[in-house]
């Protein structure tokens, strides 16, 4: 078989790479297999870029054409200029190079023309019918930037393989695109992978330094690790850091990404700029800083009091009218001397009775007995030390007065970016597990966005929600998906609430925090795309299918479904992110699977019910949504999207987006 | 000059196998597509399918798949038709032609040279 | 497949006359079309190719036009060595290269 047939193989430089495919395609399948990896048709300007196409090209036979990224519409010559009236398909005839194979002659161009590279001699271009098959196409990759391919060292078993976010594989690369992936293989048995990723400082490197094929294990020089070293079961040594730091980009070493963080209340680390700020119980970001903090007027959300409603700097109070006095749960009025019977008439036999005693609600405690998982966006709730204002009564609401939460701003997730108070926020005093579900709630403004109900029977044990574990390889940046990693957590000891936590993975600098919802900017709106929920959690999810769109209800309602639970003051997103304490390092996160689990609705950013579509929405038809690369996890699996890569430096910088600008013109081309 | 011949039995017994050669001379015989196209007695043209000197490539009209097989010896500038289990229908002048690859600056794949043709009759 | 329906399928002419012949494509095949001159007992010759360049050493009374589904052949002075019979080809690769059934051009 031919040997310049037979792979596709690339050159790249600090800025770009060409890429030949020797697949018969014609001129419109070529420009779309370039742009669905990616990039586009071939555009060499520049002298230098011609040379790097030849050298890619080589001495191929003279019967082979390739497709670059030239064509002319029909009477369109313009034979005194340099490309004859054809356009680049970036939408441009800038040019400082051209090769045509003959002069210009004065015909009337009648027709549309394509242009194909000669793989032979000195690969000139030949104008000819778009509707060709020709023996193979040349696309083109701008980013960024790029890594230059890693030095061999003494104890490698081979080169390193690379592998291009464009999905070519070779050891025959000089520089390396940003989001590539470096494998490198040990003579001891183990091995490494570096990806090309954006440093701190600027630029791009590798995400590891060398050496990559130190000595056996964690004992010499603990493996080059900062603080831990953990010898994988496949052999190889990577390190981890303690609790409230974060591995640096060379991959050994150690930073506190909160050392700096201009946070006024609490610091976190995580999100893209490293940190994310929180605020304490009762307060919320500023919107015009969100490392600033603001009191939350509580007494605005509708039924907070029964009757009466007093706002404090960092909290509020319920009083009651004359003759009326503030029952047990420091919420509800009844007449004086009436106290707790008509609570009780009116909640009805689903609610638990007011006066359990302490042994009952250990009990209580030792029942619930569910696996915890997580879903994106659910409010988080966690036991911490004693905060410095709690709430110390617990809301009972009648089947006509639910909390109403109202429609969030933007700042869940909270915004990323002070005094480091160890990550443990002021938190909702719970006693008892919440059961979450969604109903029709009177909303309290015409802000709140539409609230889609779900209810649920009771479930057994055997129909809990399910523990879902996704393990996903790392990822450059524009590919890393929210992560979705959960395990079972140990049963919460007696008169302690579930905790809901998470830690995020450690991520190179410039990623989207995980577990946020992935938000893209396009023009003036924002999309926010979360991951789909797994298919198969029947009953709960086949309900929330049924009756939800693909992405879940704009509003998050509370229907508190026990006697004793927490009041939550407000659901601006300060307070419903105010409870993130760290787990362990294996990234567990947790949700209480309530043994009458309802709906769990996502709380999101207001969307308009336009956009919600599929997480990826490619704005040309002929594009494809990356699917993520995953370990099979145990089953169910969870199957997350990719946000696609954002466009960057040109000719990629037209992108899908530039697609969508011109997709009348390109469509009338192509 | 540009030349090619084609040559081969003139009669083949129905179900047997018709083996044509085509000889090409005057270019660089990896560097051009080869053709086949046969003409029925009185009627138009068909194309068989053509074959890559360079690469062994081939691309065989539906019509023929699992019956037409096109070889090529580059030593000999040589290619190859066979066409198994003939009948009457087969019986046809069989032609083979290069592929153009450029012409005064355009590529095209239209067939610039043919050969003389060979009559082929199918016949017990 | 991709079909080639040509017209007419014979025509007479006097020395002299312009001559058309038309070739519809069945799909778009761009500018992929050749027109081939066969005289009796010989192989066909090609005059046409990329549906109007005129290929070497091909007089320039015969000339093509045409793009997309629609192609005409011209001589616009019909001599008596054009009798033959003229074909039009389409050879976009895909799925493969088909004729039009031909067209035999006479002398009145």
């Known amino acids: 078989q031919d040997p310049w047939a037979a792979e596709p193989r690339a050159a790249c430089g600090p800025s770009s790479c060409y890429a030949l495919f020797p697949r018969r395609r014609t001129f419109l399948e070529a420009w779309r297999a370039c742009r669905e990896l990616g990039g586009d048709l071939a555009t060499p300007r520049t002298p230098e870029e011609a040379q790097r196409v030849d050298s890619l090209v080589g001495a191929g036979p003279a019967s082979r054409l390739l497709w670059i990224g030239l064509q002319r519409q029909a009477r369109q010559c313009q034979l005194q200029r340099p490309l004859r009236g054809f356009t680049w398909t970036t939408g441009d005839q800038d040019t400082a190079f051209t090769n045509w194979a003959q002069p210009a002659s004065g015909g009337p161009c009648p027709a549309q023309r394509c242009v194909a590279l000669e793989a032979s001699g000195e690969h000139r271009w030949l104008e000819g019918s778009c509707t060709l098959a020709v023996d193979g196409y040349l696309c083109q990759f701008g980013f960024e930037g790029a890594c230059p391919a890693l030095q061999d060292e003494a104890g490698q078993a081979g080169p390193a393989v690379y592998t291009t976010p464009f999905h070519l594989v070779s050891t025959e690369f000089e520089w390396l695109p940003f989001g590539s992936v470096a494998a490198v293989q040990c003579q001891a048995g183990r091995g490494a992978s570096l990806l090309c990723v954006k440093q701190p400082e600027g630029g791009v490197g590798w995400s590891r330094a060398g050496p990559l094929c130190l000595g056996t294990g964690c004992s010499p020089d603990n493996g080059g690790c900062e603080h831990e070293c953990v010898e994988e079961v496949d052999g190889h040594v990577s390190c981890r850091c303690t609790e409230g730091f974060r591995l640096a980009a060379d991959g050994r070493s150690c930073e506190d990404p909160c050392a700096q963080a201009p946070c006024e209340q609490q610091c976190e680390p995580g999100g893209p700029q490293g940190y994310s700020c929180h605020c304490r119980l009762g307060f919320r970001p500023a919107e015009d800083d969100p490392h600033r903090c603001v009191d939350t007027d509580e007494c605005q959300i509708a039924g907070v009091c029964q009757q009466m409603c007093v706002n404090y700097v960092g909290g509020f109070e319920c009083y009651c009218s004359e003759g009326h006095e503030l029952e047990a749960d420091g919420i509800s009025c009844s007449p004086a001397g009436a106290m707790g019977a008509q609570a009780s008439q009116d909640l009805g036999d689903e609610l638990l009775d007011d006066g359990e005693d302490e042994e009952d609600e250990d009990e209580a405690w030792k029942a619930f007995n569910g696996g915890w998982t997580e879903m994106p966006g659910i409010l988080w709730m966690e036991p911490t030390q004693p905060p410095d204002f709690a709430l110390a009564y617990r809301p009972s609401f009648p089947e006509d007065r639910e909390p109403q939460i109202p429609y969030p701003e933007p700042t869940w997730p909270p915004p990323l970016s002070a005094p480091r108070v160890p990550y443990h926020s002021s938190v909702l005093s719970v006693t008892r597990p919440v059961v979450v579900s969604a109903t029709h709630p009177t909303l309290p403004s015409a802000h709140q966005p539409p609230v889609i109900p779900a209810t649920h029977p009771a479930l057994s044990r055997d129909h809990q929600i399910p523990v879902i574990a996704a393990n996903y390889p790392d990822l450059p940046s524009a590919y890393q998906p929210g992560i979705l990693s959960v395990s079972h957590s140990a049963q919460p000891p007696a008169h302690q609430p579930p905790m809901i936590s998470t830690k995020y993975p450690e991520l190179f600098p410039a990623h989207q925090s995980p577990m946020f919802p992935d938000t893209r900017v396009a023009g003036t709106q924002t999309t926010t795309h979360l991951p789909g929920i797994p298919p198969n959690h029947a009953p709960l999810v086949t309900t929330l299918g049924a009756q939800l769109p693909p992405q879940a209800p704009d509003a998050l309602v509370l229907r508190t479904q026990a006697t004793q639970l927490p009041i939550i003051p407000t659901a601006q997103p300060s307070l419903t992110t105010t409870s993130r304490s760290p787990v362990s390092p294996a990234h567990q996160i947790s949700v209480p699977a309530a043994t009458q689990p309802a709906a769990l609705p996502t709380l999101l950013p207001s969307q308009s019910p336009t956009n919600q579509t599929s997480p990826i929405s490619p704005t040309h038809p002929h594009s494809k949504a990356p699917q993520i690369p995953r370990e099979d996890g145990p089953s169910p699996k969870l199957a997350l999207w990719l946000p696609s890569p954002a466009p960057t430096a040109a000719p990629t910088a037209l992108g899908e987006a530039g697609l969508a600008e011109h997709s009348q013109r390109d469509d009338r081309w192509l | 000059q540009v030349q090619l011949q084609e040559s081969g039995p003139g009669l083949v017994r129905p179900s047997q196998t018709l083996s044509l050669t085509c000889t090409a001379s005057g270019y660089t015989f990896t560097d051009y597509v080869i053709h086949w196209v046969r003409q029925p007695p009185g009627r138009g043209l068909e194309w068989i399918g053509y074959?890559?000197?360079?690469?062994?490539?081939?691309t065989y009209n539906q019509k023929f798949k699992g019956r037409v097989t096109m070889l090529v010896d580059t030593s000999s500038n040589t290619a190859y038709l066979r066409l198994s289990s003939v009948t009457a229908e087969d019986t046809a002048v069989y032609y083979c032609?290069?592929?153009?690859?450029?012409?005064?600056?355009?590529?095209?794949?239209?067939?610039?040279?043919w050969g003389q043709g060979s009559l082929v009759t199918v016949s017990s | 497949d991709i079909q080639m329906t040509q017209s007419p399928s014979s025509l007479s002419a006097s020395v002299g006359d312009r001559v058309t012949i038309t070739c519809r494509a069945s799909?778009?095949?761009?500018?992929?079309v050749a027109w081939l001159q066969q005289t009796p007992g010989k192989a066909p010759k090609l005059l046409i190719y990329?549906?109007?360049n005129r290929y070497t050493g091909v007089p320039s009374r015969f000339s093509g036009s045409g793009s997309g589904t629609d192609y005409t052949f011209t001589i616009s002075s019909l001599q008596p060595e054009d009798i033959a019979t003229y074909y039009c080809q389409q050879y976009t690769n895909y799925p493969m290269y088909t004729f039009g059934q031909g067209t035999k051009v006479q002398i009145k």
């Open positions: 799909q778009n095949v761009g500018t992929a």
């Open positions: 032609a290069r592929r153009g690859n450029s012409y005064d600056g355009y590529f095209d794949y239209s067939m610039d040279y």
């Open positions: 990329s549906a109007s």
């Open positions: 074959i890559n000197p360079y690469d062994d490539d081939t």
